[in-house]
């Protein structure tokens, strides 16, 4: 016998397309950016890729995901220092041996160009003009997102 | 010479308990359950805890939190099955030899009573009556949430 | 102000042990990739170890690797060095230095120390 | 591990002069190298970095150029405070960090 719980999961796989009237967020919250229908916060400490991930999570956000060049590009253009390195939510996946956003999306190899090798604890950071392969223990920078959206949006099913 | 970002950033650290208009969350979203402050949303499918934790934010949400003992028997309440483990968001800290929230807080000695070895890769999980110790890799269910919050909510500091 | 001062350096016999610190001030120590870099009288210049934030990621230049240790205490804003079995190559002016921020394991050295003198000779 | 080798290994010059120095390194570093000035019984300072970054607080009179294994110091109009040794470093994310052997830059 099903659970209420389990009763409502089964309902959210058969209902992944449902929008749902509830407040979206119209306006970036204070101190994040906007860049087109995201609002982003890039960090001032540095932590390695899991606390960063963990740290957008506790701010109701996610590490950020990038769609294409084009945001990519849009992004970087925000970074003012050459140097600096920021987590982006895309890490190696050994298991499936491919580069896997935190979405559980794959990496269309065309989006972006990583400089260094795609293996085992490997994470990705971007720079000001570069995409870099970096050992996901490395202690840097990230970048949160979180969606603008209209008042009527998307439900949440599993991933 | 700091970028606007870094400014922004230094900005935030020295405006921890500012609040800011913006829309809060003030229903909870189509299939996430309300529990006091708070929506919960239970997985129907498994992950290991780093996955879940993705999952969680790639919702804009957080694995779930749990304040004390209180929230902790409610959050059980709504457990059906006396089986079933869900992560939550609290895992092993090697570096401080401590149980840490993804928030950045230790765990409180007194507010869970944890069954199982305090130890490298272990996250923890809840049943409908306990609480365990678990390797991270393990595959089970998880909780995210979300914080209903009024119109008038905290901005998002670095952790 | 920002500054970085090395101290424990000293004449010290083949075989002995030295630990070097070096105290941090003027700006947010957790958050930087610290390194002790060295340069023997009259040559050019050798990373030696870096130590991540955190503490958690170490590494060693081949030449000091098993002998040497480094260490940080974040509340203290200090770094350490911990030298032992010491040898007459290992005498050089040891150099505290912070990387720029958020560059990762990618370092370059944007402060650094006055340095400290150890000499290894019998 | 990656080998840089500077050349020359000292230059003399007069100050008002262009003074180049270049840097080799054994395999390919992409961007990860920083140039270094040091004066005698000082610790070094951090000039360029990521190949072509000024560092904060440094002339533009020094810039950096290259990528790959082929980077470029260049002091465009020589003072008498630049009379000093210059080092690279490469800056690859796999230790060791590795330093050229400096090039000297004396006094015509």
């Known amino acids: 016998q099903k659970s209420s719980i389990e009763k409502c999961s089964v309902d959210i796989q058969q209902s992944r397309n449902k929008t749902t009237e509830r407040p979206g967020l119209l306006n970036c919250p204070i101190y994040w950016q906007q860049l087109r229908e995201k609002c982003l916060l890039f960090s001032h400490t540095v932590n390695p890729w899991n606390n960063s991930l963990a740290d957008c999570s506790t701010k109701e956000s996610s590490l950020l995901l990038i769609r294409d060049k084009d945001e990519l590009i849009h992004t970087q253009n925000l970074i003012r220092d050459k140097a600096i390195l920021f987590w982006i939510g895309l890490n190696f996946s050994l298991s499936e041996k491919n580069w896997k956003w935190i979405n559980g999306s794959f990496l269309n190899s065309n989006d972006l160009e990583i400089r260094g090798d795609a293996k085992e604890n490997s994470c990705i950071s971007i720079s000001q003009t570069s995409v870099y392969s970096e050992y996901c223990s490395t202690e840097i920078r990230w970048i949160c997102q979180k969606e603008l959206t209209p008042v009527r949006n998307k439900v949440y099913p599993d991933s | 010479q700091k970028s606007s970002i870094e400014k922004c950033s230094v900005d935030i650290q020295q405006s921890r308990n500012k609040t800011t208009e913006r829309p809060g969350l003030l229903n909870c979203p189509i299939y996430w359950q309300q529990l006091r402050e708070k929506c919960l949303l239970f997985s129907h499918t498994v992950n290991p805890w780093n996955n879940s934790l993705a999952d969680c934010s790639t919702k804009e949400s957080s694995l779930l939190l749990i304040r004390d003992k209180d929230e902790l028997i409610h959050t059980q309440n709504l457990i059906r099955d006396k089986a079933i483990l869900f992560w939550i968001g609290l895992n092993f800290s090697l570096s401080e030899k401590n149980w840490k929230w993804i928030n950045g807080s230790f765990l409180n000695s007194n507010d869970l009573e944890i069954r199982g070895d305090a130890k490298e890769n272990s996250c923890i999980s809840i049943s409908q009556t306990s609480v365990y110790s678990e390797y991270c890799s393990t595959e089970i269910r998880w909780i995210c949430q979300k914080e209903l919050t009024p119109v008038r909510n905290k901005v998002y500091p670095d952790s | 102000q920002v500054q970085l001062v090395e101290s424990g350096g000293g004449l010290v016999k083949p075989g002995g042990s030295l630990r070097l610190s070096c105290a941090a001030s003027?700006?947010?120590?957790?958050?930087?990739?610290m390194s002790w870099i060295r340069q023997a009288p009259g040559k050019g210049l050798e990373w030696v170890s870096y130590?991540?934030?955190?503490?958690?990621?170490?590494a060693y230049a081949d030449s000091v690797k098993g002998r040497f240790t480094i260490s940080r205490d974040n509340s203290k804003n200090t770094l350490y060095l911990q030298m032992n079995s010491l040898r007459a190559e290992d005498t050089a002016v040891y150099y505290c230095?912070?990387?720029?921020?958020?560059?990762?394991?990618?370092?370059?050295?944007?402060?650094w120390g006055r340095g400290t003198l150890v000499t290894v000779s019998s | 591990d990656i080998q840089l080798t500077q050349s020359p290994s000292s230059v003399s010059a007069s100050v008002g002069d262009r003074v180049t120095i270049t840097c080799r390194a054994s395999?390919?570093?992409?961007?990860?190298l920083a140039w270094y000035q040091q004066k005698p019984g000082k610790a070094p300072k951090l000039l360029i970095y990521?190949?072509?970054g000024l560092q904060s607080g440094v002339p533009s009179r020094f810039s950096g150029s290259g990528s790959g294994t082929d980077f470029t110091l260049t002091i465009s109009s020589l003072q008498p405070e630049d009379f000093a040794t210059y080092y690279c470093?490469?800056?690859?994310?796999?230790?060791?960090?590795?330093f050229g052997g400096g090039t000297k830059v004396e006094i015509k």
């Open positions: 230095a912070r990387s720029l921020m958020a560059t990762g394991t990618h370092l370059y050295f944007d402060l």
């Open positions: 003027g700006f947010t120590f957790s958050d930087y990739y």
């Open positions: 130590i991540s934030p955190s503490g958690a990621t170490i």
């Open positions: 395999q390919g570093i992409s961007s990860w």
């Open positions: 990521a190949a072509s």
């Open positions: 470093q490469q800056s690859t994310s796999f230790p060791p960090y590795t």
